[in-house]
Interface confidence: low
């Protein structure tokens, strides 16, 4: 297996965020509420929407786009250049598939290090790990082709936007209310 090496070409340079929590990857937590929140994406230097589960998570979570921008985005020029890897695959390509601890049923793709191919799996909707792609193409571009564009160097640069899809086993017995 090729070892993952640090990136050598980042333009513009990554600046140190005003607050350290701005560099945290988005974390919707293990709970299953449906709360619209915003996080700062260190890869794009933009505030983006995500669905928060209602508990755990981290401080990179804001009630409004404005608050997110005020805390994290104001010191960054808009970043248009993608991060590139010198060689090898991002280290998260070697993580096992992980559906997380929630109970949605979302089709996602992961890189199977045994078969050396991207394969489909069912994702629960929260947590899990970064070996989790919305499309087969994105998975192939990131993990099958020896790198290319994508994130996941260290935790500080890892950020993913999680799409929440409600659902669960047929016997699931709760009355759902999208509160907050």
């Amino acid at each position: 297996d090729e070892e993952f090496t640090n990136i050598t070409d980042i333009k513009p340079p990554l600046q140190k965020p005003t607050h350290s929590f701005c560099a945290m990857k988005v974390d919707d937590g293990p709970c299953r509420a449906y709360i619209k929140r915003f996080f700062f994406n260190i890869l794009t230097h933009q505030c983006e929407e995500f669905i928060y589960g209602g508990c755990e998570g981290n401080e990179n979570r804001f009630e409004s786009l404005e608050e997110c921008k005020e805390k994290c985005a104001r010191d960054y020029p808009k970043m248009t250049t993608k991060l590139t890897f010198q060689k090898g695959k991002p280290d998260f390509c070697f993580l096992e598939e992980d559906p997380g601890i929630c109970r949605g049923y979302i089709t996602r793709y992961f890189y199977n290090n045994q078969s050396k191919q991207c394969e489909r799996f069912k994702y629960g909707g929260c947590l899990g790990n970064l070996n989790n792609f919305e499309s087969l193409e994105e998975c192939k571009n990131t993990c099958e082709n020896g790198g290319g564009s994508g994130g996941g160097l260290n935790d500080i640069f890892e950020a993913q936007k999680i799409e929440w899809h409600e659902g669960g086993p047929p016997h699931h017995h709760h009355h759902h209310h999208h509160h907050h």
């Epitope: 293990p30 709970c31 589960g53 209602g54 992980d98 997380g100 601890i101 899990g128 209310h177 509160h179």
Partner: antibody
């Protein structure tokens, strides 16, 4: 019908070990995170540990970190709690429960009593 | 000492309305974390009563309702019945305790008469 049945409790000396099991039925076990919650005699509830549906993510209360290990065997629909270096304050009824909406535990087992005493 | 504070005991007559309070802090309820409520009848396992602040699982009577505001939450029981005599626990998440699910100390509800 959802059923969770704990076993493995008993009397153990301080410093000893015990392994609890929780047999699950009536739901797709691998689709659910599971937790252990304990209750000392005459006291309140205390969360101990949780594990993701796949077993890939584990969480522990500070009071048991480094001593207890949660695991699961999805092929056997069974949850485990390996308890090492047991202390008198670990004496409690241990419940397994499945994680559901909003961090709630929506189904609970009947509990198994662990007594740590010399 | 529990992270969430509940009154140790409460009592009410059949048919009355009782409210059990649960007081937290800025690191749990005040940080927008949901609260759950459990009922534990004598000698039995806890049962989920309210999840996500104010949602009832199916099978829980609508006599039970929950709310949360700021650093406090409450469980209201209307039309109190003898079978409601039990211990009630609130539960949430506390971000200051390295990712710990936390409970209140429990409230023993006695139905009089």
């Amino acid at each position: 019908e959802v059923q969770l049945v704990e076993s493995g409790g008993g009397l153990v000396q301080p410093g000893g070990s015990l392994r609890l099991s929780c047999a699950a039925s009536g739901f797709t076990f691998s689709s659910y995170a599971m937790s252990w919650v304990r209750q000392a005699p005459g006291k309140g509830l205390e969360w101990v540990s949780a594990i993701s549906g796949s077993g890939g993510s584990t969480y522990y209360a500070d009071s048991v970190k480094g001593r207890f290990t949660i695991s699961r065997d999805n092929s056997k629909n069974t949850l485990y709690l390996q308890m090492n270096s047991l202390r008198a304050e670990d004496t409690a009824v241990y419940y397994c429960a499945n994680n559901g909406a909003a961090a709630a535990w929506d189904y609970w087992g009947q509990g198994t009593l662990v007594t740590v005493s010399s | 000492q529990s992270v969430l504070t509940q009154p140790p005991s409460l009592s009410g007559a059949p048919g009355q309305r009782v409210t059990i309070s649960c007081t937290g802090s800025s690191s749990n309820l005040g940080a927008d974390y949901d609260v759950q409520w459990y009922q534990q009848l004598p000698g039995t396992a806890p049962k989920l009563l309210i999840f996500g602040n104010n949602n009832r699982p199916s099978g829980v009577p609508d006599r039970f309702s929950g709310s949360r505001s700021g650093t406090s939450a409450s469980l209201a029981i209307t039309g109190l019945q003898a079978e409601d005599e039990a211990n009630y626990y609130c539960q949430s998440y506390d971000r200051s305790l390295s990712g710990s699910m936390v409970f209140g100390g429990g409230t023993k509800l006695t139905v009089l008469g």
